[in-house]
Every structure is written in C-alpha cells, then in structure tokens.
C-alpha cells in the first residue's frame, strides 16, 4: 500500500489504478476510517458520504476537505479494459502545522548556580501532537533532570482535536558573566517538514549576590517566656537559593538538622541562653545573625508594671 499525508482542510484525490478513465467502469471504493467502524463501501451513485468522500467520473476518490476522522485505509478494486482486477491501497494520515511557537513569560536574566526558569515555549494547533525542543546557543539542549529541567504539557482541543504543547525550561547556569541564547523549536516529525523556530532570547547570567543581611526573629517578642511556653526562632535571609541554616546556643552549635526555624516547645530554665543562626551560602560561606537572648521567668518576675505591655510585647497581669 501507499502512505499518503494530507493537510487538514485540504482536498485529497486518490486514484483508482486500472479503472477506465470514463464510464462504464467496474470499480468499488471502500474505506475504514474514524468515520466508520468497519469497512464502508461507497455507492458509485453518490449519497450522504459525498460530503467527505466522493467518487469522481474518472474513478478517483475525492476527499474535499480532509479531517482527523479521515485518517485510515482507502481501497479501490477496479476491473481494467482487459478484464483484469487491479487493487489500490492507501494509508492516509493527516497533519496540521501549528502557528509559530512562542516563548512566553521569558526570564529577564539568570542567576548562576541556582535554578532559573528560562520561559515557557507554547505551540498551538498541531496535529499530530509533535514535539517541542529547546536550544542553547543553537545546540539542542538535552534535559538531564539536574542542570537542565523541562516540564511538558500536552492538551487536545475537545472540538477541533488539535494539540497545544507547552514546555517550561529551567536551567542552572554554571557561571556568571555569560550571555546564553535560548530558542525553542516545534517539529511534527513528518518527512520533508522543517521545524518551526521561536525568536531567540538572549539572557545575561549574573553571579548570585551575597545575602543582603540575616535577621533573627523571635516569638514571643523580646525573648521572655514563662516556663512551659513555646519559643519560635526564625532565621530570615534574602538569599537565593535559600542557604542551609544551623543554630548556635551560647557559642556552641546545636546538633539539629538544618532549618530556618527553631522551635523550643515547653521551655525550661535549661533553654535560657543566647541564640544565633548561621546561614551557609554555596558561593559566599557562612554568615551569622546577631544574637538574641531567651529568658524563662515566672509570670510577673522582672516583668513590666502591672497590666501593661512592655517593650518586649509580653503582657503580664499581677
């Protein structure tokens, strides 16, 4: 059989080999497509199927406007002038070229050593679905799941059956000072069909800046707490990516897993002391916060005057 590729919406003519070019003709066209469940034999006199597949006077079959449901097999059986039976067999596939792909929500710049979303490549109106590929400086980018991450989504329009593809690229640039160019291309995967390319985007890669300072927040404010109360210490850092945070009490590291939050539940006098957090940034080393003092006192002890709220933010009543 012969493989035929037809563009959606375009006419397609399939010739019936061996059929005399003019009536009288002995021929039979049958099809098995998305419009049928099994083989459908077309009436030479024409009928309701003529809108999708009509036998022409020369014996050829005309599909006036091919659609997705016309994908399938078409067969003609004809008797030639010498009485010999000749068969034609066609496997029809359809395609639709989408609009030019676009990179939406592109990044304005990238930061070295951290994950950066470059942008999302979108292609609308393809059939079959096809594929989106990313290119860096003209070379194909192969996602490795680490430095190069691609998140893909394919949706099909419920009425037209055409596909929309989305591909989100995230990269971790190794060094700053470079100006990589990213582009995206769509390919249908059909022979003799060139890929469609987006306009390229060139981005500056900057070195990650040092953290802009580190703050240690304490709750309750002032660090004064009654026995059995809870203290929450939060290490606030404006660095990307978030660094690892370790905790120090009275100058000694606490043997805890790294976390930007330190929770002290049901505090006792043994929890009193001076606390600080240390943020370790991959490219800038450790940075310690100013210390805060935690004091555990009985209600009223050394507290502010009766019924008032002191600077510590802790209200006490006699």
């Amino acid at each position: 059989g012969q493989n035929i590729t037809a563009r959606i919406g375009e006419p397609l003519v399939l010739s019936c080999k061996g059929a005399p070019k003019k009536p009288p003709q002995q021929l039979e066209w049958k099809l098995n497509t998305g419009r049928t469940e099994a083989w459908k034999v077309l009436s030479p006199q024409g009928g309701p199927w003529d809108s999708v597949a009509r036998i022409l006077p020369n014996g050829s079959l005309l599909l006036p406007a091919t659609g997705i449901v016309d994908e399938g097999t078409f067969r003609c059986r004809a008797t030639n002038r010498r009485g010999k039976e000749v068969k034609s067999n066609y496997r029809v596939r359809v395609y639709q070229i989408p609009g030019k792909p676009e990179i939406v929500d592109p990044a304005s710049e990238l930061t070295a050593s951290v994950p950066n979303k470059v942008g999302t490549c979108v292609s609308e109106g393809s059939y079959p679905a096809g594929t989106l590929s990313w290119h860096l400086d003209g070379k194909l980018l192969i996602p490795d799941g680490k430095e190069t991450l691609v998140k893909e989504e394919t949706r099909r329009h419920p009425e037209t059956g055409l596909f929309t593809l989305r591909s989100e690229l995230t990269v971790i640039p190794t060094q700053g000072g470079t100006h990589p160019t990213f582009s995206c291309s769509f390919s249908l995967g059909l022979p003799r069909r060139r890929p469609l390319n987006t306009a390229p985007i060139q981005l500056r890669v900057r070195e990650p800046g040092p953290p802009e300072g580190i703050q240690l927040l304490v709750e309750p404010e002032g660090g004064i707490v009654a026995p059995g109360g809870t203290v929450t210490l939060t290490c606030a850092i404006s660095a990307q990516p978030p660094p690892q945070v370790h905790w120090i009490k009275d100058g000694a590291p606490l043997p805890l897993a790294p976390s930007p939050v330190l929770l002290l539940p049901e505090v006792g006098h043994e929890d009193e002391g001076t606390y600080s957090c240390v943020a370790t940034h991959p490219s800038h080393g450790p940075q310690e916060s100013p210390p805060v003092s935690i004091r555990v006192t009985e209600t009223g002890d050394e507290g502010p005057a009766e019924g008032s709220v002191g600077e510590s933010g802790l209200g006490t009543l006699a």
């Epitope: 469940e37 006199q45 309701p48």
Partner: antibody, heavy 119, light 107 residues
C-alpha cells in the same frame, strides 16, 4: 439563531407545477447541505431531495426523480424546490431542513409549507 | 434500499414511566441514525444525533443507544411535554429513510 422559513405552498391541479422557497438565516448557508422532507396528512416523514453545499450535486428518491428539482442560491441564502407533473400523492407539508449528509443528518427544520394537489 | 422498521407504532404510558422505542435497519448503517420528536402541527425536532449523542437543549432523560443494526431511543422518566410522535432516520445511504414513527400517548 438558525431559522428556516418555507413559502410557496398552495393548492395546485394534478399535472401542474409549483416552486417552493426556503429562506435561511443565522448560519453560514454555503457550509451546509440542504434537504426537503415532506409529510402527507396523517402520515410519516419522507425524504424528497438533497443538495450539497456548492449546489453542484443533487440527490432524489425514485418517487420524485425527473419531476422535482432542488436548487440553491448561496448569495441569497435560499433553497428551492421546483415541482413539476404534480400528483395527488404529492400532497403534503414540505419541510426545509439543514443537512442531509453524514456530518449532520438533519439538525434544524423549518415550520413547513402545505402543498395540496387536487382538482 | 434500506428499511428502518420502527416499533411499536404507538404506545400508551403515564408520566414518570420509562419508554423505549426501537428502530431496526435492514443493513449496516454504522452510527448514522438520528431521532426526532414531532408534535401535532409542528416541525420535527432533533433529539439524538449519530445514534447516541444528545442534541443541544434536549433534556438528559432522552438517550440513544445502538447494538449492531438496532437503535433505541429511551425516555427515562416520561414528562407531560414528551407526549408526541418519534421518528428515527438513517442517513448513511440514499434514499434517506425514516422509520414509520411511534406515537406516545397518555395512558
């Protein structure tokens, strides 16, 4: 809103002729096949004629072939049925319907026009 | 020519009843069958297209099914406005053929 309005039905003598019209609105007329269906008094529905969207191809059952001619004017969004050599058995309400091919069947119908063939 | 044999030709039912109407095609017509409802003095209205699909604006109590060349229209719970005549149509081959109709009357 799709609308189909038939006109031209009247009393006619056997052997006479009549031309029915159907004015279409609310859709892209030249995208659809169009059809005439009739219903004799107290009887069921009977297909009379269909025409493809371009008007190049027409289809009839044996009961009206060579007597009736379906045509269309896409510029005027109008469908016609020319009926010649009318017989008493052609007495019916004639409906204009959108469709007639495998993509649609018939999805919208007009209200019909009555043709009476009697002497 | 294809024959569409519709049964029953008439039936009496009460509001709330489940009603089933069948059309049998004399040869394979694929799923190219429509169902119509017609009230006296009115034009037919399409209920079901391509054997099983509910047309726009048609209540969900109507449904269509197919088994080979047998096509069924079901009204799950008959309503007062459903008393009418129902027709099937095959549109797979010319001549296009309607079933003879089923008149649904109040019991």
């Amino acid at each position: 809103e799709v609308q189909l309005v038939e006109s031209g039905g009247e009393l006619v003598q056997p052997g006479g002729s009549l031309r029915l019209s159907c004015a279409a609105s609310g859709f892209t007329f030249n995208n659809y096949w169009m059809t005439w269906v009739r219903q004799a008094p107290g009887k069921g529905l009977e297909w009379v004629a269909s025409i493809d969207n371009s008007g190049d191809n027409t289809y009839y059952p044996d009961s009206v072939k060579d007597r009736f001619t379906i045509s269309r004017d896409n510029a005027k969004n109008s469908l016609y049925l020319q009926m010649n050599s009318l017989r008493a058995e052609d007495t019916a309400v004639y409906y204009c319907a959108r469709g007639g091919d495998i993509t649609t069947g018939f999805d919208y119908w007009g209200q019909g026009t009555l043709v009476t063939v009697s002497s | 020519d294809i024959q569409m044999t519709q049964s029953p030709s008439s039936l009496s039912a009460s509001v709330g009843d489940k009603v089933t109407i069948t059309c049998r095609a004399s040869q394979d017509v694929g799923f190219y069958v429509n169902w119509f409802q017609q009230k006296p003095g009115k034009a037919p209205r399409r209920l079901i297209y391509r054997a099983t699909n509910l047309a726009d604006g048609v209540p969900s109590r109507f449904s269509g099914s197919r088994s080979g060349t047998d096509f069924t229209l079901t009204i799950s719970s008959l309503q007062p406005e459903d008393f009418a005549t129902y027709y099937c149509l095959e549109f797979d081959e010319h001549p296009l053929t309607f079933g003879g109709g089923t008149k649904v009357e109040i019991k």
